[in-house]
């Protein structure tokens, strides 16, 4: 798998969507992990609900939120209040027992906001590798705003 590069502004939210084959990954939980070094282990940040039928409910660890639309085959990760320390290499994973299959590798880059408190929503463009497999990004234009996905109320 090649790596998808996504850029977000410090202090804002970054939304990553990893698509997958819904039938192939039926019944499997998903996870978002941070890779420690190029060949190092991937440290779990957050995983979807322990009950697969409730995978669409948001699960949070700190400022990272995950939710999985298992019927559409899209797992969405939101990194809220992006900080410089959030930059790095991540993976979307599909969990099967103790094994984890990589759905997408994502390199998160954090940009300092040159306009400080002004809207910088149009100042960046996500870069996609040639083997782009569905990771997408949505960048909120107002600070700490997050797109609700999917509805839970």
């Amino acid at each position: 798998l090649n790596t998808t590069v996504l850029q977000g502004m410090a202090g804002q939210s970054l939304r990553v969507s990893c698509t997958y084959d819904a039938l192939k990954h039926w019944g499997r939980r998903k996870a978002w992990c941070r890779q420690l070094g190029e060949e190092g282990p991937c440290q779990r940040v957050v995983s979807t609900h322990g009950v697969w039928l409730l995978a669409f409910l948001k699960k949070r660890n700190g400022s990272t939120v995950i939710a999985d639309d298992t019927l559409a085959g899209t797992v969405t990760i939101t990194l809220k209040n992006l900080q410089a320390g959030d930059a790095g290499l991540y993976q979307c994973q599909s969990l099967r027992g103790r094994e984890a299959e990589v759905l997408q590798k994502v390199l998160v880059e954090v940009l300092e906001d040159p306009l400080d408190d002004q809207d910088a929503g149009d100042l960046w463009v996500p870069e996609e590798s040639s083997s782009f497999e569905g990771a997408q990004v949505e960048h909120s234009t107002s600070r700490n705003q997050e797109t609700s996905f999917p509805p839970t109320s």
Epitope: G27, G50, V51, L53, L54, R60, D69, L71, S153
Partner: antibody, heavy 126, light 106 residues
């Protein structure tokens, strides 16, 4: 009228099997996650397991204490959910309820259970 | 597993009183909490879902609030027909109920 009616309870010896039925009416059965709960005499409520809607291919989930012994299934043509209970233990003695999960849309629901049956008593004793 | 601690286990109040029941989760459960009413010999009835949403057809004297680990269920003016046991139920981990609160009339 939206309704759930359980049946099949009774007295059974330890180690034996029993199948409970939950007959639904008044709503589109296939569109809803169905769940089973139980309540031992004088005790609180305990979730047993649930079965997903048709969209989720009737995927099942169970509480740890019944996993491998109990099986939930559904028959959309009859609007019935079943709870097959094998290797019954005395601690399985309880009133068993079926309930419907609250739905937001075709794909999304919440495990708030908005319609319940009247319950059926299962007594496991020698 | 998440433990749900409901208190008090029982209470006695007069008609018209404001009644408050609390439910504490052993870890953060966001707003993934429901409240039910169960009358003797009857099935539970959903009153509040997602911590604060009133179920259709439920009287407005019932309300719920809270998020994270601490949740509150309130009956603003107790009525004779409210005599029942009330349960909270979380769904952040699996499906776990609190121990129940038995409400009686003085």
């Amino acid at each position: 009228e939206v309704q759930l009616v359980e049946s099949g309870g009774g007295l059974v010896q330890p180690g034996r099997s029993l199948r409970l039925s939950c007959t639904a009416s008044g709503f589109t059965f296939d569109d809803y996650t169905m769940s089973w709960f139980r309540q031992a005499p004088g005790k609180g409520l305990e979730w047993v397991g649930f079965i997903g809607s048709k969209a989720y291919s009737a995927t099942t989930e169970y509480t740890a204490s019944v996993k491998g012994r109990f099986t939930i299934s559904r028959d959309g043509s009859k609007s019935i959910a079943y709870l097959q209970m094998n290797s019954l233990k005395t601690e399985d003695t309880a009133v068993y309820y079926c309930a419907r999960g609250k739905r937001y849309s075709y794909t999304y629901w919440t495990p708030a259970f908005d319609v319940w049956g009247q319950g059926t008593m299962v007594t496991v004793s020698s | 597993d998440i433990q749900m601690t409901q208190s008090p286990s029982s209470l006695s109040a007069s008609v018209g009183d404001r009644v408050t029941i609390t439910c504490q989760a052993s870890q953060d459960i966001t707003n993934y909490l429901n409240w039910y009413q169960q009358k003797p010999g009857k099935a539970p009835k959903l009153l509040i879902y997602d911590a604060s949403n009133l179920e259709t057809g439920v009287p407005s004297r019932f309300s719920g609030s809270g998020s994270g680990t601490d949740f509150t269920f309130t009956i603003s003016s107790l009525q004779p027909e409210d005599i029942a046991t009330y349960y909270c139920q979380e769904y952040d981990s699996y499906i776990t109920f609190g121990g129940g609160t038995k409400v009686e009339i003085k």
